[in-house]
Interface confidence: low
């Protein structure tokens, strides 16, 4: 085993590699000293290092560890943030396709309908929007709204065009009627359910992308203990006090060090794997009614066939719901 | 924007075009997203050794440091006597995570928990009786992925999936789209391309 | 490790043609989208357009538009920015720069 | 085009202090997806730029954690919280919303 070289007899070395850290040079000794009142370079013989450089080793340590930290985490954090916001202005658009849709649906089919429609259509995609995005909105409420404002309209538009434009008073007793007569048939069940299921999962997809975000930044800005310090000063300053400048920590030296320092953060290993994997899960279970992208994209021609349907059946509704609402009907005539 | 892989997003002739083939769409994107995701997922347990291999570590040399003194490089000195003096290691790692680490830990086995819940087990298929008249939707069922919609007068076809997705306009060919006269904000047809990545990388 | 090395310096007469290229090394060439951008002396930086490296597609700037020219080479990761009909104004040092890496510029 | 315009053109300052550079846009620079689509780089004598920050405040990797980047409306801020020595340079922000991408004029 080759014996340690001697330490530089002026500290000259030592001194001009410190200043590139801190400017200022009294804190270096000008000749080896024997440095007692060292507490992490524990010497052997002289050494060319004061406490305060040792303080200031500790810090830089702590620094580059940081640095280190962040950069092996940037690929990682650049590709789950660029992610989280393609798949989000992704999902806008698709809702804006969907809305677009809708409307066309309406203007190529029922023009009639158009104005009182396009605004029920823009706020259930409003709704949509914000629900993604994390709002407190219930899907079925959603759902059952449009189909509430819509009816309505179709009624006085569609199969009974001769009620006048007050029809306020009947408006209340319509919306009562769409869903005790279930007027659209199962219909908006079935949009209620593709469109909670496919949302939810869009929803969690996304909240799962922000959370990744999340886990990276928080270990990418750890402050490193002051034990965890010292381990890495001892590691990779304390040579210089001996003179030795530009030697290199061993490897598996470095490895235990490494371990040590990075303890806490190893314990997220476990569920960042189950993280990934319980995305992975979700991702190949979103498609027909869990991928908002075919649902909603579809939601027109839904809508289409839920207005024929109760076209098909208008001759025994305008009866039915001609009785149910007649009270209101007779104010609004009087 | 920046930032958008361009490649993702193609043009409004989706709309128009009865066969699309090849182009991205959202799920074959989230796909891709994930095989990127796993090839990060021993990330955290491969810290140690990522941060050692891209600090100064002794690799060619005869002698390294073992923070005490010089050694050769594959004695048993080079990893054991740097760690003698030292505040026990062991107790370093018994002091358990930082509160903000055991924060995101409990964050993760929460959305952990959500993300389980709501995957789709498989072959599980929407029912398919619509209403108790016996009502149905033409040839489309929810088996039919390329079938969105029946198509009444007037009623545009619409190939199932955007493939994907013009409109995040940013396409860098916006202008090169026959007969788009569509209006646009100059955010929505114009793309700062200097962060794009392709595929993210 | 992520590099963009350019092409050495050149010195061009008024009205000639200049191509400069700029060898990726160290990721997946055809993932990223390479800017150029320049500095003439004393002048603040300036985007001369882009090319996105995996399927040719570029974008000029407005002022350059008709005489700057990107190109690349994807068997060699490298990408090329050729201005013509070159004014004593395009002095000027000419980075190609990619998210966040940037060649060493080429005058 | 969207215009960037940094003030101060110059500033002067002491290792250990903070120091704050502003950049104000011609519009809004916020996406629909909520982020900024500004970026701050920092270009050291004789070197190319380099990048601190980008989406308004996120800091790049290796970037010391004293640099940060904050946005009000159309006016960003890149502050330094302690000056050191190595922080010398030309400072820029380049907006990323929309071609052509522009640089502001620089803060010395």
């Known amino acids: 085993q080759p014996p340690p070289p001697p330490p530089d007899a002026t500290c000259h070395q030592v001194r001009s590699f410190f200043q590139r850290l801190q400017p200022g040079l009294k804190w270096v000794p000008e000749t080896p000293v024997p440095g007692s009142d060292l507490q992490v370079c524990l010497p052997k013989g002289p050494t060319c290092c004061s406490r305060k450089m040792e303080e200031k080793y500790q810090l830089t340590a702590r620094l580059n560890m940081e640095q280190l930290l962040q950069s092996a985490s940037m690929e990682l954090k650049f590709l789950i943030i660029q992610n989280a916001a393609v798949f989000q202005e992704a999902f806008e658009i698709v809702v804006r396709h969907a809305k677009n849709y809708t409307n066309a649906m309406f203007k190529n089919n029922y023009p009639s309908l158009t104005p009182q429609a396009f605004e029920f259509v823009g706020e259930f995609f409003t709704d949509v929007s914000l629900y993604i995005l994390g709002s407190d909105i219930n899907v079925d409420d959603m759902v059952n709204e449009l189909f509430d404002s819509l009816f309505p309209v179709i009624y006085t538009q569609l199969m009974n065009p001769g009620l006048p434009d007050s029809a306020l008073d009947i408006n209340e007793c319509l919306r009562g009627a769409r869903r005790d007569l279930k007027v659209f048939g199962n219909f908006p069940k079935l949009i209620m359910t593709q469109v909670s299921k496919s949302l939810q999962v869009t929803r969690i997809f996304l909240q799962a992308l922000n959370l990744g975000i999340e886990v990276i930044n928080t270990t990418d800005h750890l402050k490193f203990s002051k034990d965890c310090g010292r381990m890495l000063t001892r590691m990779w300053y304390c040579s210089y006090c001996q003179g030795l400048m530009m030697v290199k920590p061993c490897g598996g030296y470095c490895n235990v060090v490494m371990q040590g320092c990075m303890a806490g953060v190893v314990e997220i290993d476990k569920y960042w794997r189950e993280y990934i994997l319980s995305l992975e899960e979700l991702v190949n279970g979103m498609y027909r009614i869990y991928d908002m992208e075919n649902v909603l994209l579809g939601l027109f021609s839904t809508i289409h066939d839920s207005i024929q349907y109760v076209q098909k059946n208008a001759g025994k509704l305008t009866t039915t719901i001609g009785k149910l609402c007649a009270h209101s009907q007779q104010r609004q005539y009087r | 924007s920046a930032y958008y892989p361009e490649d993702l997003f193609i043009d409004k002739k989706v709309l128009k075009v009865a066969h699309v083939e090849h182009e991205e769409t959202l799920s074959s994107r989230r796909r891709e997203l994930i095989q990127k995701l796993k090839s990060f997922i021993s990330f955290y347990s491969a810290l140690p050794g990522y941060i050692c291999s891209h600090s100064p570590v002794a690799e060619n040399d005869t002698l390294c440091w073992n923070g005490q003194e010089l050694v050769e490089r594959y004695s048993q000195k080079a990893a054991r006597n740097g760690m003698k003096n030292q505040f026990n290691l062991h107790e370093l790692k018994m002091k358990g995570p930082e509160p903000v680490v055991s924060q995101i830990i409990d964050k993760l086995k929460h959305i952990n928990q959500l993300l389980r819940t709501m995957s789709v087990p498989k072959g599980r298929v929407l029912d398919k009786n619509l209403d108790e008249e016996g009502f149905e939707s033409g040839d489309c069922g929810d088996d039919e992925d390329e079938c969105i919609g029946g198509s009444g007068d007037g009623m545009m076809k619409v190939k199932n999936q955007l493939r994907f997705l013009a409109e995040l306009a940013y396409d860098l060919d916006v202008d090169d789209v026959p007969g788009n006269n569509q209006q646009a904000t100059p955010k929505d047809n114009e793309i700062s391309t200097f962060h794009n990545l392709g595929n993210v990388h | 490790q992520v590099q963009l090395v350019q092409s050495g310096a050149e010195v061009k007469k008024p009205g000639a043609s200049v191509k400069v290229s700029c060898k990726a090394s160290g990721y997946t060439f055809t993932s990223y989208g390479i800017s150029w951008v320049r500095q003439a002396p004393g002048q603040r930086l300036e985007w001369m357009g882009w090319i996105n490296a995996g399927n040719g597609n570029t974008k000029y700037s407005q002022k350059f538009q008709g005489r700057v020219t990107i190109t690349r080479d994807t068997s060699a990761s490298t990408a090329y920015m050729e201005l013509s009909s070159l004014r004593s104004e395009d002095t000027a040092v000419y980075y190609c720069?990619?998210?966040?890496?940037w060649g060493q510029g080429t005058l | 085009e969207i215009v960037l315009t940094q003030s101060p053109l110059s500033l002067p300052v002491t290792p250990g202090e903070p120091a704050s550079i502003s950049c104000r846009s011609s519009?809004?620079?916020?996406?629909?997806?909520?982020?900024?689509?500004l970026d701050w780089y920092l270009q050291k004598p004789g070197q190319s730029p380099q990048i601190l920050i980008y989406?308004?405040?996120h800091r790049a990797s290796g970037v010391p954690d004293r640099f940060s980047g904050s946005a009000s409306g159309t006016d960003f801020t890149l502050k330094i919280s302690r000056v050191e020595a190595e922080d010398v340079g030309v400072y820029y922000c380049m907006q990323a919303l929309q071609t052509p991408l522009t640089f502001g004029g620089g803060t010395k």
């Open positions: 720069a990619t998210v966040v890496y």
């Open positions: 989406l308004g405040s």
């Open positions: 519009q809004s620079l916020l996406h629909s997806n909520g982020y900024n689509y």
